[in-house]
């Protein structure tokens, strides 16, 4: 299953499959997730070790048993790959690291006014993988405001150094934010020239293209089909690059197929997995396990559930079958691709779906061992769970926010439905940033069911929580995916990095905002909050957030939207925007419904009709 917990001051001993430099544990975890054999990782922050060569070291590990012995190491951080973690699987990494220089091949230098502009330049450059920016206070005047675009053979820095007034980060191409655009065309009977960066075996050009997309240095590819004249080169997928970023030449060649990486696509990237099943094909590799199952789909599910399994072959040979069940060969290799592909067999083969980010049709939870006033504009994909609840009352308008918590579930505030309980007047927009982008043709979700908490009463602040079941499930993308819920009665976690988002008013007597706003607000203890609201009862099922001096808060139109907090690199839905005295007033914090206190209710209501829990537990 999916394991998300991080282990502080712990280092996994042995099992090394690769090592690299990464700026933090979260990036190390992402590299582990996308490495074909990595199940566990250990990361050494700069503060944890004196050995300069091992600072920022990220160690990717494998284990036949799925675990390794942990040794105590002050400052080290260890954890699990996010394979099998559904929507949490993403190669997108937005963080900017202050006081850190990520080294690599510097291939472009320009003057820019901000680190965000530098990151944008990197994202819009086909070869840029990461960057460093020297701020205006950098010690050498001639380097100030320099934006260095970089790459390396492995896509990660060749070294990371602590350096004042330097900020570094990664390209946002894996976030589907590149302005370059991509070539979707597949070119039949055409071979590209240039430098081969890797060679793998794939059953078709589409798998080859997906592997190219997620390979750090692949810009285009050539695939040799299973009828290519040279037998030893059949099904070979050559991942390629060039200085210019495009093929320098192409040659007409029978039984070859060429194409481009889709990493530069805007708004949609292919999933990092291959779901197609190939009948009459055997995939060769190292044997992991053999099991008898009924049907090729069950074989694929079995492979997906066994975390080390990368691909499988389901044999229909009479000697491999008994009654209705046949042998399912679960296999793996060093690079995640078959070591041999045979055609005209009585088998069917395919890949594990462990890296598919659609996950199951569920709500995401975690286990643990009203515009925003004073906010700023959000960017694409920053809060992919945020939805806009709109009503079509001839004129259409945004009324509330909400949070996507599963393919078919949105969590919001009950008071959003005061006076508007009719489900067919509501339209739910997900994956949007600007309300002005919504036109008559913009797709929206309709409501199948509104589930208001049974103890909620109109005009009272208690139990202000409601679930919306959508008529049709949503697909997950970088711009539309769920937020994880906290564990039941989560009281031990101290959240220090919390944000409220919404399109609500920017002042008490304001108007709905066009661009989704975000504001960083600290949580306030319930005791402190109660002092500020002596006429109301602040219950343990509420959570408050705000600054003593005011100035930053949720406001009208933000209701129902998320209060999210980042903990151990993972965002969780801590609160639902509910009520407050005015907006952003001094010593009047915002009051939010505390989601952890309603986990039993959420779980009960999101049970599917067949009684199967719709919950996904990353831990």
């Amino acid at each position: 299953g999916c394991l998300t917990q991080l282990y502080e001051n712990a280092f996994f001993r042995g099992g090394d499959v690769a090592s690299m430099y990464t700026p933090n544990a979260q990036y190390c975890q992402m590299r582990c997730t996308f490495h074909p054999r990595c199940l566990l990782f250990s990361f050494l922050p700069a503060s944890s070790i004196n050995d300069m060569e091992k600072r920022f070291g990220c160690f990717l590990k494998d284990s036949v048993t799925g675990t390794l012995p942990k040794v105590h190491r002050t400052g080290a951080v260890s954890g699990h790959s996010l394979k099998q973690c559904g929507h949490q699987i993403s190669a997108c990494h937005r963080d900017i690291y202050k006081g850190v220089d990520m080294r690599g091949v510097n291939f472009n230098v320009s003057k820019v006014s901000s680190v965000e502009e530098c990151q944008k330049r990197c994202t819009s450059n086909i070869r840029c993988q990461f960057f460093s920016y020297a701020t205006q206070t950098f010690h050498k005047a001639e380097y100030r405001n320099n934006c260095l675009l970089k790459y390396s053979p492995g896509g990660t820095p060749t070294a990371i150094k602590v350096l004042s007034n330097v900020e570094s980060g990664f390209s946002l191409k894996p976030c589907a934010l590149s302005e370059i655009g991509c070539h979707m065309n597949i070119f039949q009977h055409l071979a590209f020239s240039d430098v081969d960066v890797a060679r793998v075996l794939t059953p078709d050009a589409f798998v080859c293209r997906t592997i190219c997309t997620y390979h750090p240095n692949c810009l285009f590819f050539t695939f040799y089909t299973n009828v290519w004249k040279i037998e030893s080169q059949r099904n070979v997928c050559l991942l390629k690059t060039s200085e210019s970023g495009t093929p320098s030449s192409s040659t007409p060649q029978e039984n070859t197929i060429s194409g481009y990486s889709l990493l530069t696509c805007k708004r949609t990237l292919p999933e990092p997995c291959h779901s197609k099943i190939y009948p009459g094909v055997d995939f060769g590799g190292e044997e992991l396990n053999v099991t008898f199952v009924k049907g090729v789909n069950v074989c694929q599910e079995t492979c997906t559930k066994m975390i080390r399994c990368q691909f499988f072959t389901y044999s229909l040979l009479p000697e491999d079958c008994k009654e209705e069940k046949c042998k399912c060969f679960l296999r793996l290799s060093m690079d995640g691709s078959p070591t041999r592909i045979a055609y005209g067999t009585q088998g069917s083969s395919g890949y594990s779906l462990r890296l598919c980010n659609t996950g199951d049709n569920s709500v995401c939870t975690t286990k643990t061992s009203t515009r925003i006033v004073g906010g700023t504009n959000s960017s694409w994909g920053e809060w992919p769970w945020q939805v806009s609840l709109q009503v079509k009352l001839t004129a259409q308008r945004h009324l509330c926010g909400g949070s996507l918590i599963g393919h078919q579930w949105v969590l919001t505030a009950a008071h959003c439905f005061d006076g508007l309980p009719l489900q067919d007047v509501w339209r739910i927009y997900s994956g949007i940033l600007n309300l002005s982008d919504i036109t008559k043709d913009t797709p929206f979700s309709q409501i199948k069911e509104i589930i208001i908490h049974q103890n909620y009463k109109v005009s009272e602040g208690n139990h202000d929580i409601a679930l919306i079941k959508l008529q049709a499930p949503l697909n997950y993308t970088e711009f539309q995916k769920p937020i994880c819920l906290p564990s039941k009665g989560d009281t031990s976690t101290i959240y220090t990095n919390c944000w409220v988002t919404g399109w609500g008013f920017s002042k008490e007597k304001g108007e709905i905002q066009n661009i989704l706003q975000k504001v960083n607000i600290p949580l306030v203890t319930n005791e402190e909050c109660q002092k500020r609201y002596q006429d109301y009862k602040i219950t343990q099922r509420m959570v408050c957030a705000g600054y003593k001096e005011g100035g930053k808060d949720a406001c009208k139109g933000d209701s129902g939207g998320p209060l999210v907090c980042k903990h151990n690199g993972m965002w969780r839905l801590v609160g639902i925007t509910s009520w407050g005295e005015g907006c952003a007033r001094r010593e009047q914090p915002g009051v939010y419904t505390k989601v952890a206190e309603y986990m039993d209710w959420i779980l009960e209501k999101t049970q599917s009709s067949d009684g199967k829990a719709q919950m996904q537990s990353p831990a």
Epitope: L393, T394, A395, R397, L399, L420, L422, V425
Partner: antibody, heavy 121, light 107 residues
Framework: QITLKESGPGILQPSQTLSLTCSFS??????????VSWIRQSSGKGLEWLAH???????RYNPSLKSRLTISKDTSRDQVFLKITSVDTADTATYYC?????????????WGQGTLVTVSA | DIKMTQSPSSMSASPGERVTITCKAS??????LSWFQQKSGKFPKTLIY???RLVDGVASRFSGSGSGQDYSLTISSLDYEDMGIYYC?????????FGAGTKLELK
């Protein structure tokens, strides 16, 4: 039970300002989704929608008359008002205030009985 | 503005007869259409909303259908009291616009 009742001056002269009041009961204009429209009916132009006001004070007007129309409300007194400036004989009509079906704006569920306004020199 | 073309402008029918009135919008109105009846000297009475939903208390002989640009009101078995003028109105977008009306008379 939901009722709406229009009141107006009956007769007025060209270039004057027409002031209409809609007094209603059985619902509140502070309820989310609620709204009230003004519609008029004349023998020459048939039925014509004039303006709509929502619970949150959002206002919509017929573009062909927008410069002359002002819709407003007094939520505490359960009243909606319409002002039409610079009237002429073409504004002679029966004026209705209407409320949507149920909670949502779904056609006109409830009509007032109408008030006849005659513009005459 | 969305133009609503209603037909016929007038018609005669006998009690018990099936009567259909149509309304065509100049663009797709997503079923945001209402039908109402007005008897001589009286204020209008809504029959149908959202193209096919019957208002509570309205006789079941009235029904609405249609989608996109084309809509119709059907009276399955005409009654004496059904005489009057029938109008359609679109409320997909402002300004709301009406059909010119269909005058239904007894044969």
């Amino acid at each position: 039970q939901i009722t709406l009742k229009e009141s107006g001056p009956g007769i007025l002269q060209p270039s004057q300002t027409l002031s209409l009041t809609c007094s209603f009961s059985g619902f509140s204009l502070s309820t989310s989704g609620m709204g009230v429209s003004w519609i008029r009916q004349s023998s020459g132009k048939g039925l014509e929608w004039l303006a709509h006001i929502y619970w949150d004070d959002d206002k919509r007007y017929n573009p062909s008359l927008k410069s002359r129309l002002t819709i407003s409300k007094d939520t505490s007194r359960d009243q909606v008002f319409l002002k039409i400036t610079s009237v002429d004989t073409a504004d002679t009509a029966t004026y209705y205030c209407v409320r949507p079906h149920y909670y949502a704006f779904d056609g006109f569920g409830y009509w007032g009985q109408g008030t006849l306004v005659t513009v005459s020199a | 503005d969305i133009k609503m073309t209603q037909s016929p402008s007038s018609m005669s029918a006998s009690p018990g007869e099936r009567v259909t009135i149509t309304c065509k919008a100049s663009q797709d109105i997503n079923s945001y259409l209402s039908w109402f009846q007005q008897k001589s000297g009286k204020f209008p009475k809504t029959l149908i909303y959202r193209a096919n939903r019957l208002v509570d208390g309205v006789a079941s002989r009235f029904s609405g259908s249609g989608s996109g640009q084309d809509y119709s009101l059907t009276i399955s078995s005409l009654d004496y009291e059904d005489m009057g003028i029938y109008y359609c109105v679109q409320y997909d977008e402002f300004p709301l616009t009406f059909g010119a009306g269909t005058k239904l008379e007894l044969k």
